[in-house]
Amino acid sequence: LRPSRVHNSEENTMRALTLKDILNGTFSYKTFFPNWISGQEYLHQSADNNIVLYNIETGQSYTILSNRTMKSVNASNYGLSPDRQFVYLESDYSKLWRYSYTATYYIYDLSNGEFVRGNELPRPIQYLCWSPVGSKLAYVYQNNIYLKQRPGDPPFQITFNGRENKIFNGIPDWVYEEEMLPTKYALWWSPNGKFLAYAEFNDKDIPVIAYSYYGDEQYPRTINIPYPKAGAKNPVVRIFIIDTTYPAYVGPQEVPVPAMIASSDYYFSWLTWVTDERVCLQWLKRVQNVSVLSICDFREDWQTWDCPKTQEHIEESRTGWAGGFFVSRPVFSYDAISYYKIFSDKDGYKHIHYIKDTVENAIQITSGKWEAINIFRVTQDSLFYSSNEFEEYPGRRNIYRISIGSYPPSKKCVTCHLRKERCQYYTASFSDYAKYYALVCYGPGIPISTLHDGRTDQEIKILEENKELENALKNIQLPKEEIKKLEVDEITLWYKMILPPQFDRSKKYPLLIQVYGGPCSQSVRSVFAVNWISYLASKEGMVIALVDGRGTAFQGDKLLYAVYRKLGVYEVEDQITAVRKFIEMGFIDEKRIAIWGWSYGGYVSSLALASGTGLFKCGIAVAPVSSWEYYASVYTERFMGLPTKDDNLEHYKNSTVMARAEYFRNVDYLLIHGTADDNVHFQNSAQIAKALVNAQVDFQAMWYSDQNHGLSGLSTNHLYTHMTHFLKQCFSLSD
């Protein structure tokens, strides 16, 4: 005999999240980013895979490419030429690193309703793009750049020295892709397609990381990647520009490097075209506290690029590294010489500045104890940007418009009051001349994408509101989330706490700290997520906390640069401090506290477990860094300097996980890593394991064969199932 269900009680029809829900992606959300093709038109791939053109002003739409055509070549992506005559169709996607992939490309002629035959593109292609005007094609094949004047024409080969793992043209090498650009491409068309700029990376002298890829063969194969670790030889970069109308006339012309940069090891950080005959390059010293922005002009008489010293703008940090995570990029105004850029103001907050002649004379556009985060668009009369100013929550993002046509400039928050409870974290996508824009809200409520008039900011329509997700969540007991702050010794520690649905302050709960904590990162954000930690709170009754300590972003340079040259100290201290504060709140079972993290978070969780505080019963490190000598030069040296005696070798040695092996004796430690991790090499975990074995310290470990830093596919399910068992065992929760 079973009791009949009480239908009028909401509690009885509600269920907790299951691990299966998370692994199946049952509660994933959709966003809508229009593929803008003009001021008022955009393309979108419909649910049934047709490519549809939407005209905002008429409210009408029509299909320009049928799903039948897409399916005929198994296309997973497309790109319309600016003259609207052709579409490239991308298939056979094969992932390489974080952004890079190779693919097969077919060109479809819209006017004739057929694929372009003759002079087909080679395969697989590493990168392909249309010119900004017309239908010229630039592509990279086998590390060389090719140009087609029209899709059916034979290609013109621009570079000839490309060689696998040695010379990269038009695409970055591993370290530039991951840590500097960060993109899959390194070529840039001028605004009207007259010129094509590209980078050449010479990796001939870079040491190679080699690891086994087991596959199914009798013998594993070896993956070799030129990968500069801290202090190692770096790629040598050169920038060239070629006239695409007459490419054979003078050939590629090298752009000179500023003298103050070229005097020692340096990086190229970005290229921005201003006009067809003016280009802006950004360079960075290897010791990344000096950046130079160089504006170069085409000399018609010599067919060369001239970069006068008077057009060099220096950005320097005296308290840390230049920029935030990356040095910011300029957004040029219509006069084609002045620009807007985000950098630290005198109070140590990142703000928008207007540079007309020199950086010293920059006019500060935004100011306050908050940070400007991104400049989306500058038009004749408006500048659109995002910041975390509103209500002083650093983990929010709102979109603002500053009128630059009038004086004094007036500021308006476009998003602050739109859907205040649901939406506090926005990004935006603008059409040509900012005639219209899409807002994508990521939370804290269910994400929603909307279309707006660029003049009035009026909402025109909802593009995606995730109705299905909303309905699916109606009978789910989601955890409660709080974002609050702790004030400790003049440091503000923002935290997010995820609480079980029936949370009762008078009870005691196990606590799991989820940490990332890397320089210029932010974990405490007002975004929507139904993920593994949501399940742990909803079903397993855990309290989960995320804490942004020293080194994290968007709260000023004092917090950000606190970790400069000293990684692995304050990030860990601040997690520990927060845990002590959480215990004081009275609802944490101090005998059941765990910490886990991935990547940089794995490093911090390992150091926290080995801190000797006795606070943590157990913890997990997924793909952790274990010594900064093992990680990439560009990233590591930005924050740590060089691992040399006369620089910062001592702290490189002090900050390893291996040095703390003894301290793992009194905690339960689960160490996890993919054997084919191109980013944080398996070497890191291998060395932790070796040190623990040598110290005769017991620990648990799991490796994922042939998996990279993301541990994707079936490994994901195995990983989260394994970590769940580990935590439930640690917290004495029944299975």
């Epitope: 002003e57 008429t58 009408q60 029509y62 819209l110």
Partner: nanobody, 115 residues
């Protein structure tokens, strides 16, 4: 239902001029990007000129400086003014949205340029 009716073609001597018209119904031409296309015997159809819903225009290299695309909003009509015509301009000329829909073309109007 969108309908496009091209007219104004004919036989003309090299160096001469023609003005093609396209009566548009079912959509407002001024609010849509529209284009003129042509197909020469034994050749593929190609874009001749495109006119954005603003004022932006695109011309094929072969006709730049000789052809002008325009429209009359009141009449919902698209035009192509063709000057300094050459024998290689001989083709059937079509108007359509720009880019064209995947499944619709009008009848077109024949332009023949004799030398």
């Amino acid at each position: 239902q969108v309908q496009l009716q091209e007219s104004g073609g004919g036989l003309v001597q090299a160096g001469g001029s023609l003005r093609l018209s396209c009566a548009v119904s079912g959509i407002i031409s001024s609010m849509n990007a529209m284009g003129w296309y042509r197909q020469a015997p034994g050749k593929r159809r190609e874009l001749v000129a495109g006119l954005g819903s603003g004022v932006s225009t695109t011309y094929a290299d072969a006709v730049k400086g000789r052809f002008t695309i325009s429209r009359d909003n009141a009449k919902n009509t698209l035009y192509l003014q063709m000057n300094s015509l050459k024998p290689e301009d001989t083709a059937v000329y079509y108007c359509n949205r720009w880019p064209p829909p995947y499944d619709y073309w009008g009848q077109g109007t024949q332009v023949t340029v004799s030398s």
